[in-house]
């Protein structure tokens, strides 16, 4: 029979023939031949392959480096690699994290909409009219003014984006 | 006092294996990653391999990668650098050494580094035939 | 990987007079948190490695005030104000940014 020009899925072409392609986790040791199968080994530890395969090495695991800010979020395995993230306060500047940066902070003025996450930045947005923030801060949001009324006050300075009401006494009608 | 004993050293040949063991003492071993660092007769130093402080991390430099394996046994306080299919050019002092760390600096950063604080007193590996 | 240099290889010293080690890297040391990862070894003749600075300028516990280290990104300097005849040995920098760890090639103090 004619040799084969292309190989099926998992299995691909090494000298005139089709051999069956290393599962996931597995490395290749050696090709098939007409009387034998394709020989492979899995990975050791700390190391990795995640698809079908004809490698020969295995891929080591991503070491998450404190110094750096990260951790693992996910022990690898030998079909997968280790899955960093980044410690509290600190968030990821690529979908593979590789490095972390500090967690931004929402100046007065602003209040924070969406807390950072290990992988995305803290998210601010400014205090609308009748709320303040007098701080720089990744956690509080946008405080309301004091409502002066229920407290039976009068406000005697204007809020503002960064400031509260100020409230004082009514002024008594002398009879 | 903090203390790193290395062991295991000695003379091999091609292709045998060897494992050093390095002993702590003086201080928490589960809190701190480590490292072996290696030095060859009249050279400078070289990085071998890292291992988290829990051990589920680890990574080794591409010259010994697949045939050196760094790990730990954090209830002995002893760190291991197993050496298999040892070559000539693998003679050389091999060092533990501690990565230093604190709790959070002044910037918000999570763990502090501190360099490389503590070191042992080496371990000579030679491969002859 | 990042490559470290060294310069110069060698640095014979007088007693009592300045000395100073320059160390360059590939690429920026310098981390979003503001740090630079560069640490300074010395190796005494016959002994291990022992840490002197580490983030670039900070000295390690127990190392007199004589050492200091400075510079940013890919240039670093370690200098020694007055050199003591117990400052001799192989002085290394090493980057801390990156796995793996690379060391520089060393510099070599000797008195003259």
């Known amino acids: 029979p004619e040799p084969p020009t292309a190989c099926r899925e998992k299995q691909y072409l090494i000298n005139s023939q089709c051999c069956s392609l290393c599962q996931p986790g597995q490395k290749l040791v050696s090709d098939c031949t007409e009387f034998t199968e394709t020989e492979c080994l899995p990975c050791g530890e700390s190391e990795f392959l995640d698809t079908w395969n004809r490698e020969t090495h295995c891929h080591q695991h991503k070491y998450c480096d404190p110094n750096l800010g990260l951790r693992v979020q996910q022990k690898g395995t030998s079909e997968t690699d280790t899955i960093c993230t980044c410690e509290e306060g600190w968030h990821c500047t690529s979908e593979a994290c590789e490095s972390c940066v500090l967690h931004r902070s929402c100046s007065p003025g602003f209040g924070v909409k969406q807390i950072a996450t290990g992988v995305s930045d803290t998210i601010c947005e400014p205090c609308p009219v009748g709320f303040f923030s007098n701080v720089s801060s990744a956690f509080e949001k946008c405080h309301p003014w004091t409502s002066c009324e229920t407290k039976d006050l009068v406000v005697q300075q204007a809020g503002t984006n960064k400031t509260d009401v100020v409230c004082g006494p009514q002024d008594r009608l002398r009879a | 006092q903090v203390q790193l004993v290395e062991s295991g050293g000695g003379v091999v040949q091609p292709g045998r294996s060897l494992r050093l063991s390095c002993a702590a003492s003086?201080?928490?071993?589960?809190?701190?990653?480590m490292h072996w660092v290696r030095q060859a007769p009249g050279k400078g130093l070289e990085w071998v391999a890292v291992?988290?402080?829990?051990?589920?991390?680890?990574y080794h430099a591409d010259s010994v990668w697949g045939r050196f394996t760094i790990s730990r046994d954090n209830s002995r306080s002893t760190l291991y650098l197993q050496m298999n299919s040892l070559r000539a050019e693998d003679t050389a002092v091999y060092y533990c050494?501690?990565?230093?760390?604190?709790?959070?600096?002044?910037?918000?950063?999570?763990?502090?580094?501190?360099?490389?604080?503590?070191w042992g007193q080496g371990t000579t590996v030679t491969v002859s035939s | 990987d990042i490559v470290m240099t060294q310069s110069p290889l060698s640095l014979p010293v007088t007693p009592g007079e300045p000395a100073s080690i320059s160390c360059r890297s590939s690429?920026?040391?310098?981390?979003?948190?503001?740090?630079?990862?560069l640490d300074w070894y010395l190796q005494k003749p016959g002994q291990s490695p022992q840490l002197l600075i580490y983030l670039g300028s900070n000295r390690a516990s127990g190392v007199p005030d004589r050492f200091s280290g400075s510079g940013s990104g890919t240039d670093f300097t370690l200098k020694i104000s007055r050199v003591e005849a117990e400052d001799v040995g192989v002085y290394y920098c090493m980057q801390a940014l990156q796995t793996p760890r690379t060391f520089g090639q060393g510099t070599k103090v000797e008195i003259k």
């Open positions: 003086g201080f928490t071993f589960s809190s701190y990653g």
């Open positions: 291992i988290s402080n829990d051990g589920d991390n680890k």
């Open positions: 050494a501690r990565r230093g760390m604190g709790s959070s600096g002044s910037r918000g950063d999570y763990y502090y580094y501190y360099g490389l604080d503590v």
């Open positions: 690429q920026s040391l310098l981390y979003s948190n503001g740090y630079n990862f």
